[in-house]
Interface confidence: medium
């Protein structure tokens, strides 16, 4: 079979060679070729060239469309690292430090506490909070972490929430909470993380982080 294929390829190649040679002879006006034959061969050749040029144009268009699509949908992603804070507020503080990500100015970290997006769309938003608490020293209420949304002209709302009971370990028992989900965000929307007791949050490398990704 392979041998037959090879013969077929060689034959096609030979035919192409003869065709090109004939065009050449037509152009030089060789007497041995009839005018009719030459016209037919020329129009056939022009057809091939037209097809090739059209294909090229289509590919060009597709590529430029891809570029436009890319411009319309740039990657938007952020990953920020927890930062200890002296503030008594329950909103966690974040920083662009260590192995952080801030893809471009379409997402920003504002006041060290919230991620704000400039484009509408579906976003995967996540937070990991590691805390160290002790049952004796904490109130009866569990440690709660909340992922919250503030859209322009709207009230704050809770998107996700998780609760863990306090450990009996001393000085404290470490636990981690992971929150994550897909949400529609409007331009100017901000997301932030709230906890019941920020003084119990572990700020060691990799323990507590927050981020989003536009889908």
């Amino acid at each position: 079979h392979r041998r037959l294929d090879k013969i077929e390829d060689e034959r096609n190649l030979h035919e192409d060679f003869v065709f090109m040679k004939t065009i050449q002879r037509c152009n030089t006006g060789e007497r041995s070729l009839s005018l009719l034959n030459c016209e037919e061969i020329k129009s056939q050749f022009e057809g091939f060239v037209k097809d090739i040029m059209l294909n090229k144009e289509e590919t060009k268009k597709e590529n430029s469309f891809e570029m436009q699509k890319g411009d319309q949908n740039p990657q938007i992603a952020a990953h920020v690292i927890s930062e200890a804070s002296s503030k008594t507020t329950s909103v966690l503080q974040w920083a662009e430090k260590g192995y952080y990500t801030m893809s471009n100015n379409l997402v920003t970290l504002e006041n060290g506490k919230q991620l704000t997006v400039k484009r509408q769309g579906l976003y995967y938003i996540y937070a990991q909070v590691t805390f160290c608490s002790n049952r004796e020293a904490s109130s009866q209420a569990p440690f709660i972490a909340s992922l919250c949304l503030k859209s322009p002209g709207r009230f704050e709302r809770i998107l996700l929430r998780a609760a863990n009971t306090h450990s009996s370990a001393k000085p404290c028992g470490q636990q981690s909470i992971h929150l994550g989900g897909v949400f529609e965000l409007q331009p100017g929307a901000s997301v932030f993380v709230n906890v019941t007791d920020p003084s119990q949050v572990s700020h060691g490398t990799g323990f507590t982080s927050f981020g989003l990704l536009k889908l």
Epitope: A84, H203, G204
Partner: nanobody
Framework: EVQLLESGGGLVQPGGSLRLSCAAS????????MMWVRQAPGKGLEWVSW????????YYADSVKGRFTISRDNSKNTLYLQMNSLRAEDTAVYYC????????????????WGQGTLVTVSS
Amino acid sequence: EVQLLESGGGLVQPGGSLRLSCAASGFTFAFYPMMWVRQAPGKGLEWVSWIDATGTRTYYADSVKGRFTISRDNSKNTLYLQMNSLRAEDTAVYYCAEGNYGSSYTMGVFDYWGQGTLVTVSS
């Protein structure tokens, strides 16, 4: 650059006292709970004492309760450990470290910890 520098260790007789200090720099000391851990020769790390960021809450391992006192001075970025009624079994290298961790330790878990100060209790 984060630095924790322990001092105050030395040789002391059983029943004696020592005061360890830990000077912190390169991070916002006042925001962090802190702790003292120790490592006896040929043993693993053992948690000794813990204090919250403001200095209001403290915890002690059962082995040191009533003998050791942890304190801090946030204006001086310094952590202290007052050790009284020392025993031979308190002989160890004492380290200060950031405190939001549980009670089982390996050195790798600490973001901020010092080089340690040796306390030897012997007659």
